[in-house]
Interface confidence: low
Amino acid sequence: KESCDVQLYIKRQSEHSILAGDPFELECPVKYCANRPHVTWCKLNGTTCVKLEDRQTSWKEEKNISFFILHFEPVLPNDNGSYRCSANFQSNLIESHSTTLYVTDVKSASERPSKDEMASRPWLLYR
């Protein structure tokens, strides 16, 4: 018989390498039976995990699993770090493994097209 406990399916030591300035969605896969639990995201700061209260979040429901999504619109350098989702379920707090974001700025300043290039060579937009 399948367990009806809430489960958070973030893999241990999971990592994402993401580009600063890009939109990004960090997913917390949540499995539950009847009532959807209250889920939150927090960012690790030393030994504490600071709750992310004023960040945009949303739910994505799929057939066998749901995803609680933390939106980065867009990513900034100080988004670098480790995150954890946690669920409140029947007075129990269930915490996920942490997932780490590595923020990079891939293109160097010297590769940046000039204003003239940008306006006159629109295909640069899709490099």
Partner: antibody
Framework: EVQLQQSGPELVKPGASVKMSCKAS????????MHWVKQSHGKSLEWIGY????????GYNQKFKGKATLTVDKSSSTAYMELRSLTSEDSAVYYC???????????????WGQGTLVTVSA | DIVMSQSPSSLAVSVGEKVTMSCKSS????????????LAWYQQKPGQSPKLLIY???TRESGVPDRFTGSGSGTDFTLTISSVKAEDLAVYYC?????????FGAGTKLELK
């Protein structure tokens, strides 16, 4: 040539709302974050927030949450900002601006509109 | 929020003079993974929109004269104009793009003596 053409000045009464526009041309509208910046008379610049026309994603300065609403109309390459419950503190020039199309340089502003002056007065 | 402090608030200069203005941030704008400083400088002339001069603290925007130089790292930044021209009389703002909300300094006004 990249251009951001903003709507004309607005004189509005306290408590009312105002919706201003920023029409973009000379580049692919959906590829760039559209930012809005406030400049009170003789004062510095305050970042209000941005909208990403590609997916409608947006981000706001907490100070302007509930005050400003950002929207876009992709078909006309136009961004809009609505300000509500206006007070004299909202009297300012409001600019739309875009940065680059990749990396963190999306968050610097290489192109600016000419500004929309909003005056709140009874 | 990161607070950007600019000094002096105004500066009276003569044409041809070298000027420096300062911008300090309340936390470091240097990102260790790429050694870049997330700081930009803008120029705003009376009745005009701001104009981007410098990004990454020291990279000049295309078309900006080389008399404008940005320098500094971490929390202390400087904009230098090597030889001021009358057309440089304006307000200069720094802006951080390291974290939300994006913030600007209060500006340094460059005036003629």
């Amino acid at each position: 040539e990249v251009q951001l053409q903003q709507s004309g000045p607005e004189l509005v009464k306290p408590g009312a709302s105002v919706k201003m526009s920023c029409k973009a041309s000379g580049y692919t509208f959906t590829d760039y974050y559209m930012h809005w910046v406030k400049q009170s008379h003789g004062k510095s610049l305050e970042w209000i927030g941005y909208i990403y026309p590609n997916n409608g994603g947006n981000g706001y300065n907490q100070k302007f949450k509930g005050k400003a609403t950002l929207t876009v109309d992709k078909s006309s390459s136009t961004a809009y900002m609505e300000l509500r419950s206006l007070t004299s503190e909202d009297s300012a020039v409001y600019y739309c601006a875009i940065g680059d199309y990749y990396g963190s340089l999306r968050l610097t502003f290489a192109y600016w509109g000419q500004g929309t002056l909003v005056t709140v007065s009874a | 929020d990161i607070v950007m402090s600019q000094s002096p608030s105004s500066l009276a200069v003569s044409v041809g003079e070298k000027v420096t203005m300062s911008c300090k941030s309340s936390q470091s704008l240097l990102y260790s993974s790429n050694q870049k400083n997330y700081l930009a400088w803008y120029q705003q002339k009376p009745g005009q929109s701001p104009k981007l001069l410098i990004y990454w603290a020291s990279t000049r925007e295309s078309g900006v004269p080389d008399r404008f130089t940005g320098s500094g790292s971490g929390t202390d930044f400087t904009l230098t104009i090597s030889s001021v021209k009358a057309e440089d009389l304006a307000v200069y703002y720094c802006q951080q793009y390291y974290s939300y909300p994006l913030t600007f300094g209060a500006g340094t006004k460059l005036e003629l003596k």
